[in-house]
Interface confidence: medium
């Protein structure tokens, strides 16, 4: 491993649409991939009238937008669906919203869905 890089071997997995997609609903996802590729965790969620609804969480493969991010933070201003990615085992357990354009308004979700 490259010094200072946080290797991602597993991520929190969640799929709100699990019945339609025919997947697990929650669990811990082992992250596989080509040896020369970096691996990340991600989280996607919606903010419905102030209520946080998780859409998906899991592994995300080699995306430069995720490099060296130890925390899962969405910085886009008011997206329809929030997305963040990070490096490090289970780094997507918690995720936050810190828009770069406006006054900082953190929206975090420290709740960890229990594995099945």
């Amino acid at each position: 491993a490259i010094l200072g890089r946080s290797e991602t071997q597993e991520c929190l997995f969640f799929n709100a649409n699990w019945e339609r997609d025919r997947t697990n609903q929650t669990g811990v996802e082992p992250c596989y991939g080509d040896k020369d590729k970096r691996r990340h965790c991600f989280a996607t969620w919606k903010n419905i009238s102030g209520s946080i609804e998780i859409v998906k969480q899991g592994c995300w493969l080699d995306d430069i937008n995720c490099y060296d991010r130890t925390d899962c933070i969405e910085k886009k201003d008011s997206p329809e669906v929030y997305f963040c990615c990070c490096e490090g085992n289970m780094c997507n357990e918690k995720f936050s919203y810190f828009p770069e354009m406006e006054v900082t308004q953190p929206t975090s979700n420290p709740v960890t869905p229990k594995p099945p």
Epitope: F13, N15, N17, R20, D21, R22, T23, N24, E29, P30, C31, Y32, G33, T44, K56, G58, C59, W60, L61, D63, I64, N65, E80, V81, F83
Partner: antibody, heavy 120, light 107 residues
Framework: EVQLLESGGGLVQPGGSLRLSCAAS????????MHWVRQAPGKGLEWVAS????????SYADSVKGRFTISRDNSKNTLYLQMNSLRAEDTAVYYC?????????????WGQGTLVTVSS | DIQMTQSPSSLSASVGDRVTITCRAS??????LNWYQQKPGKAPKLVIY???SRASGVPSRFSGSGSGTDFTLTISSLQPEDFATYYC?????????FGGGTKVEIK
């Protein structure tokens, strides 16, 4: 090197059955979800079915639901597609493809395809 | 189901040209957007995944951009081996759906 090799295609009459196989090598087959995607002659790509890493979950396109069954044998590193009640519109090249993660971020490796022709 | 609309359906270009193909999803798919290249008689090959990430072995002249509903595949300087059909595909939810394809032909 990742390799996926489909077989089992051929000519079949409407209403008939066929079983496609996809032999996988070069990776730990039991770690990955797998898909079947088809392409009718001169047409675009159409997703057919998927199965998760251990066979516990399967999903189908509406067009094949109830007629096709996807399965896998991890001890043989092989993916299957059982096709029953075949129709002329099922005529296509069938590809097996590997899913990159549990939630199918992308299909990173594909086989060369096997042609299924449904005709009387 | 999420509908994927690609444009143009075909285009003619010369070696060295900059080529842009667009793909629109019927709802937000965040960055769950992939691009595949297919040559006649061959299997599709992954080119771009997660909207912007190049697959292994894909030349740097290929790039992807976009998020939400609008996405673009750009070939900065078209090479002879790039003449093919390109498909976008969403993997945000099942069923996985593909765009209709864009055939890149020699002018």
């Amino acid at each position: 090197e990742v390799q996926l090799l489909e077989s089992g295609g051929g000519l079949v009459q409407p209403g008939g059955s066929l079983r496609l196989s996809c032999a996988a090598s070069g990776f730990t087959f039991s770690d990955y979800g797998m898909h079947w995607v088809r392409q009718a002659p001169g047409k675009g790509l159409e997703w057919v079915a998927s199965i998760n890493y251990n066979g516990g979950y399967t999903s189908y396109a509406d067009s094949v639901k109830g007629r096709f069954t996807i399965s896998r044998d991890n001890s043989k590193n092989t993916l299957y597609l059982q096709m029953n009640s075949l129709r002329a519109e099922d005529t296509a090249v069938y590809y097996c493809a590997r899913a990159a993660t549990w939630h199918d971020t992308h299909l990173d490796y594909w086989g060369q395809g096997t042609l299924v022709t449904v005709s009387s | 189901d999420i509908q994927m609309t690609q444009s143009p359906s075909s285009l003619s270009a010369s070696v060295g040209d900059r080529v842009t193909i667009t793909c629109r999803a019927s709802q937000s798919i965040i960055t769950y957007l992939n691009w595949y290249q297919q040559k006649p008689g061959k299997a599709p090959k992954l080119v771009i995944y997660a909207a912007t990430s190049r697959a292994s072995g894909v030349p740097s002249r290929f790039s992807g951009s976009g998020s939400g509903t609008d996405f673009t595949l750009t070939i900065s300087s078209l090479q002879p081996e790039d003449f093919a059909t390109y498909y976008c595909q969403q993997s945000y939810e099942s069923p996985l759906t593909f765009g209709g394809g864009t055939k890149v032909e020699i002018k």
